[in-house]
C-alpha cells in the first residue's frame, strides 16, 4: 500500500495522527522533499556567517563567510580566518611560511617547494613564501 503521506509535497509536513493530513511548514522552517513527517528549522547565518541563499518553505538557507574568512566543511559548516599568501593559519594566528615552503592561497597550509632534482631538472625560478619554484630543463 502507498503511504498517504507521500502525497504531501515539499513545503508541507504530514501528520500521521490526523489521517495523513498535509500541513504547511510554519515560518522559518522547510521540508525539501515530499512525505516528510516534520519540517526542519531553517539554518540561520549569524556572526561570521552570512546568507548566500535565503531559506524558503522548500529549501534550507545557505551560508558563506564574511570577508576575511572562508568556508570549511560540508555546506560551509565552519568559517576559518583567511591569511595572506605566504602564510598559514596556526593556533597562534597567521604565520609566515618557513623557508623552503610556500602557500599561494589565503587558506590551507604551507607546502614544500618542488624538489626539481628528483625529476632530473634544475631550478629555473627560485621559490618564495608565495610561489613554488619553477623547474627548468635538465642541467
Amino acid at each position: 500500500l502507498q503511504d498517504p503521506c507521500s502525497n504531501c509535497p515539499a513545503g508541507t509536513f504530514c501528520d500521521n495522527n490526523r489521517n495523513q493530513i498535509c500541513s504547511p511548514c510554519p515560518p522559518n522552517s522547510f521540508s525539501s522533499a515530499g512525505g516528510q513527517r516534520t519540517c526542519d528549522i531553517c539554518r540561520q547565518c549569524k556572526g561570521v556567517f552570512r546568507t548566500r541563499k535565503e531559506c524558503s518553505s522548500t529549501s534550507n538557507a545557505e551560508c558563506d563567510c564574511t570577508p576575511g574568512f572562508h568556508c570549511l566543511g560540508a555546506g560551509c559548516s565552519m568559517c576559518e580566518q583567511d591569511c595572506k599568501q605566504g602564510q598559514e593559519l596556526t593556533k597562534k594566528g597567521c604565520k609566515d611560511c618557513c623557508f623552503g615552503t610556500f602557500n599561494d592561497q589565503k587558506r590551507g597550509i604551507c607546502r614544500p617547494w618542488t624538489n626539481c632534482s628528483l625529476d632530473g631538472k634544475s631550478v629555473l625560478v627560485n621559490g618564495t613564501k608565495e610561489r613554488d619554484v619553477v623547474c627548468g630543463p635538465s642541467p
Epitope: R18, S23, P26, S57, T58
Partner: antibody, heavy 114, light 107 residues
C-alpha cells in the same frame, strides 16, 4: 524585500467570471507554496485556496470548490485565481500570501453585484 | 473544519495597559497557531507564529502563549499604534481557519 501585489478585482455581475493575479518579488517564488485568502466587508479572514511550489498539490475551501481555480507561473513569478459562477457572497478583499503566511499583499477588492 | 473562536469581540484600552486576547480552537491544533495584526484598510501582518514565536521585527511587548486548544496574545503595555484588529489562525490542517477577530480600541 518581499512584495506581493494583487490585481484584477472590480465589479462583476452574479454568475460572471474574473481572474485575479498576484505578482511576487523579493523572494524565490518557485520555492514557496502560495495561498489566496479573502475578507468580506467587516468580516474575518477566510482561506480560499493553496497551491504547492511546483503546482503538484492544490487545496480549495469547500465554499469555492468547483468554481475557483488556483494556478501559478513560476517563470513569471505570478499567482492566479480564476473565479467563475460568482455569487454575492464572494464579495471581498482578496489577498495572496506565501505558504508561511508571513507576507500578504495589499489586496484587490472584488464586488459581485447586479 | 477546525473552528477558531476569539474573545472578546472588542475591547477599549488606555495607553500603557496590559492587554490579553484569547483564541480557542475546536480541537487540538498543537502549537500551529499564528496571530495577525490588521490596521484599517491594510493587509494583515504576522506577529506570532508557532503559538509563541515572535516574527522578525515585532516589538517584544507582543507575546504569544498556549498550546492544543487555548491560545493567548498579550500586549504588555499597549501603545497607540497597536490599535487594530487582531486575528488568530491555525495552520495545523486544511482548510486553514481564522478567528473572527478582536478589535482593540482606545478608551
Amino acid at each position: 524585500q518581499v512584495q506581493l501585489q494583487e490585481s484584477g478585482g472590480g465589479l462583476v455581475k452574479p454568475g460572471g467570471s474574473r481572474k485575479l493575479s498576484c505578482a511576487a518579488s523579493g523572494f524565490t517564488f518557485s520555492e514557496f507554496g502560495m495561498h489566496w485568502v479573502r475578507q468580506a466587508p467587516d468580516k474575518g479572514l477566510e482561506w480560499v485556496a493553496y497551491i504547492s511550489s511546483g503546482s503538484s498539490t492544490i487545496y480549495y475551501a469547500d465554499t469555492v470548490k468547483g468554481r475557483f481555480t488556483i494556478s501559478r507561473d513560476n517563470a513569471k513569478n505570478t499567482l492566479f485565481l480564476q473565479m467563475t459562477s460568482l455569487r454575492s457572497e464572494d464579495t471581498a478583499m482578496y489577498y495572496c500570501a506565501r505558504d508561511w503566511v508571513d507576507y500578504w499583499g495589499q489586496g484587490t477588492a472584488l464586488t459581485v453585484s447586479s | 473544519n477546525i473552528v477558531m473562536t476569539q474573545s472578546p469581540k472588542s475591547m477599549s484600552m488606555s495607553v500603557g495597559e496590559r492587554v490579553t486576547l484569547s483564541c480557542k480552537a475546536s480541537e487540538n491544533v498543537g502549537s500551529y497557531v499564528s496571530w495577525y495584526q490588521q490596521k484599517p484598510e491594510k493587509s494583515p501582518k504576522l506577529l506570532i507564529y508557532g503559538a509563541s514565536n515572535r516574527y522578525t521585527g515585532v516589538p517584544d511587548r507582543f507575546t504569544g502563549s498556549g498550546s492544543a486548544t487555548d491560545f493567548t496574545l498579550t500586549i504588555s503595555s499597549v501603545q497607540a499604534e497597536d490599535l487594530a484588529d487582531y486575528h488568530c489562525g491555525q495552520s495545523y490542517s486544511y482548510p486553514l481557519t481564522f478567528g473572527a477577530g478582536t478589535k482593540l480600541e482606545l478608551k
